[in-house]
Interface confidence: medium
C-alpha cells in the first residue's frame, strides 16, 4: 500500500517558506480512515491520487463521510475525546466512513502559528474532497465535517475552498482568539456548508475567551449560556483529577462541546433541546421556551437543518455529565400585590411534583427584580422526567437562611425599625414544559389563602380547567 503521506500533505506557499525548503518539509496533513471503533486499529491512510487504499479499506462511496478535525494541541498527540467521537460515530452510523484529519505537526506549535496553518489544512481537506468527488457515487452532500476548537475554522476553510458545497459542518466550540470578529472568509461561517451548526461552551465576556462568542453558523447553541459548564468548576475538577488546575477547568469547559455532541450520538433516546433566544439573560428568565416557527431544535448530531436568514442563537441547560439532557420549565408567577418589601429581593424555591417523580427543591433565579402587579417569569429545570405535573410547592426562604439577606434585613430594620411583616400575594402559577410544549395553570389550594411571607410556603394544584394546550409543536414529536 502507498506510503501514508500523500501529496495532499505538502505544505503550501501560504506558509511563506522558500521554494527550496518546501520539498524537504515532511507532509503535515494526513487522512486516517478509521476502519474500526477500536483506537488500536491503525486504520488506513488516504492519499489524493491513490485509489488502492479506498478499495483495500472498503471506503463506502455512497455512505455518509465524516471528517473529524482536531484543534491546537499542547501535547502533540491525539486526545481521548477523539477516540470517543470516532467510537460514537461508528456506533451510530455503522456504514459511514470516519476520517480523522491528522494535522498534529502544524497544530503542535505556538497558537498564533497554528492559526496561520488553518488555511493550509483547509486547502488539504478541500483537495481530498475534490479528488473524492471524481469517484462515481461520491457526493459532497454526504460529507459532514466536524471540527473542534481551531479545527472548526479549518472545516470552514475546507468548506470554502472545496468545489461545490459540503453537506454539513459542525463547529465544536470554535476557537475564539484571532477569530472573534474576523471577516467571514477568515473563520467558520454559514456559507461554508449547506448546514452549519455550532456548540459554544467556553465563551467569556471577561478575560480570554477560548471559544468564539459570536454566532458563526446557521444555528449557534450556547449550553448553560455558553460559559460556565456544570461539573467543570475547580472543585469538580479537583475532585476527579489528581492535579486539578485552572487548565483542567478550561479543558473541561472547552471540551464539553465534544461530549455534548458524543452524547447526541449515543443517547439519541435522550435528546437535549435548545431554544432560540436573543441572549442568555432572557433565557435565564424563562422567556424563550417556544418551539413555534423553528424556535427549538435538538442539539448535536440530531439537529434539524435550519437555514435562517440571520444567525439563530439558541440556549439550553444541561446536566454535569452524560446523558446531558434536562427538562426545562417556564414558570409565570403573577404577583398581584405585595407589602413592606424593603430593599431585599425574596429568595424563592419551588418543588415540582409529577406523575413519574418529584423534583428536588429548585431555586427561582431572579434575574432583575420581582415586579408587582405583573407576571414574573422564571426558568427552572430538572434532571429527571417528572411526567405530568400535579402540584407545586413554593417556598420563600426565611431571612436567617442567607447571611447576605440577614445583613440586608438588619440594615432595612435600622432604616425602618417598625417594618411590619413582608408579604406577597400569588393566586396562580402558569407552567410551560419546554420539552413537551404543554401549558398548565396551577392555583392555590385554598383560594382564600394566596399570601406568602419569609419562611413560609404556598401549595398550588392543577386548576380545574386542567391542561391548557396551545397548538404548538412539541420537539419530541419529530424525533427519529
Amino acid at each position: 500500500s502507498p506510503v501514508p503521506f500523500g501529496p495532499e500533505g505538502r505544505l503550501e506557499d501560504k506558509l511563506h517558506k522558500p521554494k527550496a525548503t518546501q520539498t524537504e518539509v515532511k507532509p503535515s496533513v494526513r487522512f486516517n480512515l478509521r476502519t474500526s471503533k477500536d483506537p488500536e486499529h491503525e486504520g488506513c491512510y488516504l492519499s489524493v491520487g491513490h485509489s488502492q487504499p479506498l478499495e483495500d479499506c472498503s471506503f463506502n462511496m455512497t455512505a455518509k463521510t465524516f471528517f473529524i478535525i482536531h484543534g491546537w494541541t499542547m501535547s502533540g498527540i491525539f486526545e481521548n475525546w477523539l477516540h470517543k467521537l470516532v467510537s460514537a460515530l461508528h456506533t451510530r452510523e455503522k456504514d459511514a466512513n470516519v476520517v480523522v484529519v491528522d494535522w498534529l505537526p502544524l497544530a503542535h506549535q505556538l497558537y498564533t502559528d497554528a492559526v496561520n496553518n488553518t488555511r493550509v489544512v483547509g486547502h488539504s481537506i478541500a483537495r481530498m474532497l475534490d479528488w473524492l468527488q471524481e469517484k462515481d457515487d461520491f457526493s459532497l452532500g454526504n460529507v459532514h465535517l466536524i471540527g473542534y476548537s481551531l479545527g472548526a475554522h479549518v472545516a470552514g476553510y475546507a468548506g470554502n475552498f472545496v468545489k461545490g458545497t459540503v453537506g454539513r459542518i459542525t463547529g465544536l466550540d470554535p476557537a475564539g482568539p484571532m477569530f472573534e470578529g474576523a471577516d467571514i472568509h477568515k473563520r467558520l461561517s454559514p456559507d461554508d456548508a449547506d448546514f452549519v451548526d455550532v456548540l459554544h461552551t467556553y465563551t467569556r465576556s471577561f478575560g480570554l475567551s477560548i471559544g468564539i462568542q459570536m454566532p458563526v453558523g446557521h444555528i449557534d447553541i450556547y449550553p448553560n449560556g455558553g460559559d460556565f459548564q456544570p461539573g467543570c468548576g475547580l472543585n469538580d475538577v479537583l475532585g476527579s483529577i489528581a492535579y486539578g488546575t485552572i487548565t483542567e477547568v478550561v479543558k473541561c469547559e472547552h471540551e464539553r462541546a465534544v461530549h455534548l455532541f458524543v452524547d447526541s450520538l449515543v443517547n439519541q433516546d435522550k435528546p437535549s433541546f435548545a431554544f432560540q433566544c436573543t441572549d442568555s439573560n432572557r433565557f435565564k428568565k424563562g422567556i424563550c421556551l417556544s418551539c413555534r416557527k423553528n424556535r427549538c431544535n435538538s442539539i448535536g448530531y440530531n439537529a434539524k437543518k435550519m437555514r435562517n436568514k440571520r444567525n439563530s442563537k439558541m440556549y439550553l441547560k444541561t446536566r454535569a455529565g452524560m446523558p446531558f439532557r434536562v427538562y426545562h420549565y417556564q414558570m409565570k408567577i403573577h404577583v398581584f400585590s405585595y407589602k413592606n418589601m424593603g430593599e431585599i429581593e425574596p429568595t424563592f424555591y419551588v418543588t415540582l411534583y409529577g406523575t413519574n417523580a418529584d423534583s428536588q427543591t429548585l431555586p427561582l433565579e431572579i434575574v432583575e427584580r420581582i415586579e408587582q402587579n405583573a407576571t414574573n417569569t422564571f426558568l427552572v429545570y430538572t434532571e429527571e422526567d417528572l411526567g405530568d405535573l400535579l402540584k407545586i410547592q413554593l417556598t420563600w426562604e426565611g431571612a436567617s437562611q442567607s447571611w447576605y439577606n440577614l445583613w440586608k434585613e438588619f440594615r432595612s430594620y435600622l432604616s425602618q425599625p417598625r417594618n411590619p411583616g413582608r408579604e406577597l400575594n400569588i393566586r396562580r402559577i402558569r407552567v410551560k414544559s419546554g420539552e413537551t410544549q404543554r401549558k398548565l395553570t396551577f392555583c392555590t389550594e385554598d383560594p382564600e389563602n394566596t399570601s406568602i411571607s419569609p419562611g413560609r410556603e404556598l401549595w398550588f394544584r392543577k386548576c380545574r380547567d386542567g391542561w391548557r394546550m396551545k397548538n404548538e409543536t412539541s420537539p419530541t414529536v419529530e424525533l427519529p
Partner: antibody, heavy 119, light 106 residues
Framework: QVQLVQSGAEVKKPGASVKVSCKAS????????MHWVRQAPGQGLEWMGS????????SYNEKFKDRVTMTRDTSTSTVYMELSSLRSEDTAVYYC????????????WGQGTTVTVSS | EIVLTQSPATLSLSPGERATLSCRAS?????MYWYQQKPGQAPRLLIY???NLAPGIPARFSGSGSGTDFTLTISSLEPEDFAVYYC?????????FGGGTKVEIK
Amino acid sequence: QVQLVQSGAEVKKPGASVKVSCKASGYTFTEYTMHWVRQAPGQGLEWMGSINPYYGGTSYNEKFKDRVTMTRDTSTSTVYMELSSLRSEDTAVYYCARYGNYVGYFDYWGQGTTVTVSS
Amino acid sequence: EIVLTQSPATLSLSPGERATLSCRASSSVHYMYWYQQKPGQAPRLLIYYTSNLAPGIPARFSGSGSGTDFTLTISSLEPEDFAVYYCQQFTSSPYTFGGGTKVEIK
C-alpha cells in the same frame, strides 16, 4: 522523560494468580493506551491485551480472555495486569508497552517482569 | 488471527553486509511494524506504517512491502545491529508478532 517501571519478579505455583504493575511517568497517563506483551523463554512476542487509562476500556486477546484482567489507577498512573489459573507455559517475561492512539506503535516499553510458574 | 511468518529464522552476516529480512502475512494487512530486540532488553521500534523510520533510528534501516509481503532492509550492518528482529501487525485483533529473525555475526 517517559518511563514505564514494572514490579519485580514473581514465582508462583500452578493454579495461582499473579498481578504485575506498570507505573507510568513523564507524560499524561490518560492520553495513551497501555498494552501488555509477553515473551516465553527463547520464544517470540505475544500480545495479551490493552487498557485505555482514560475510561478503563479493555481489549483482550481471545486466548487470554478468561484469565486476564487489566485495570488502572489514575491517581498513581499505574496499570495492572492480573493473570489467573497459572500454568507452567505462562512462565515468561511480561512487558507493558505504551501505544499512542491513532499514532499506531509501541514507542516505550517497561523493563519487563519475569514470572516463573513452578510447582 | 493473522499469522506472520518471518524468514529466514537466522541470518548469518558480516558487518558492512546488507541484510534483507522477510515477513509474510497469512492475510492482507494495511501496514507492517518492525522491532529490534537485544538479549535482556525490551523490544525497540524501528519502522512503523511499513516504511517510516521511528525517531532516533539510523537511516540504514528501511522498510517496504504491501498486502502480505513485507521486507526490512539494513543496508550496511553495524556491530550493534546484531539482534533479533520482529515484525508486527495492527490491522486486526489479536495484534500478532512474527516468530523473529535472528541476525548473527558470521
